[in-house]
Amino acid sequence: NFMYSKTVKRLSKLREYQQYHPSLTCVMEGKDIEDWSCCPTPWTSFQSSCYFISTGMQSWTKSQKNCSVMGADLVVINTREEQDFIIQNLKRNSSYFLGLSDPGGRRHWQWVDQTPYNENVTFWHSGEPNNLDERCAIINFRSSEEWGWNDIHCHVPQKSICKMKKIYI
């Protein structure tokens, strides 16, 4: 039975992931029985990615490490639509590390997953980035401009946003 063997395969795959994420929320994408995409519970999903808001306050390096042990990275924001989705889950009085840094302090910003940094798809607050010693990026809320990015010192503990590709089963 085709459906039965598919289900057995799926269950064995789900068991593989349980040591990292005990619970996954899966949806059938499109009409093809092949395409089930999953995010860990209680991560949120948007397009082909899963997102997790980490409320623990850590440095940028520790925040990236925290994401990586879950199979994720600090968030890479590729579009305005993606940012609009992310901010729905953020608190206005908090700041969150992004997967964006300038390790050399020469304004060569780079994303953690090597996505090319595109000046045309950035959402810096006005006047930012403004300090060569502030080499890590956060997203925060300013009443005058709503949500945007700011450069800060990497060692200053912040909340963070993790992003991973959906898990396909």
């Epitope: 593989e16 990586s68 879950m70 199979g71 990275d73 590709k165 396909y168």
Partner: nanobody, 123 residues
Amino acid sequence: QVQLQESGGGLVQPGDSLRLSCTASERTFTNYAMAWFRQAPGKERDVLATISRSGSSTFYAESVKGRFTISRDNTKNTVYLQMNSLEPEDTAVYYCAARPLVPSEDPDNYNYWGQGTQVTVSS
């Protein structure tokens, strides 16, 4: 079941370069962290390099740091090991391996293995 197939091994001279490839049958390749290991005759299987699902995080063993580079192309379901400045001590069978979500340096933590490809460095 993830099936892995290595290619690119062979006989080279000291100082030469080789690029190994490992292609996965699994269409859900991006679910997996990948690694390269090697095993010389009578020795343990040693980790050389690991790479995260997105390719953002890599690890290298001290013995190959600066000479070997791991990378992956998720559109081709393939992971690569670029090996430069090869030495006779690099002679071994090279294996790629896959595990769900998070890389590890311990071979016991990998669920899926290729058959291996022989690399011989000799003048």
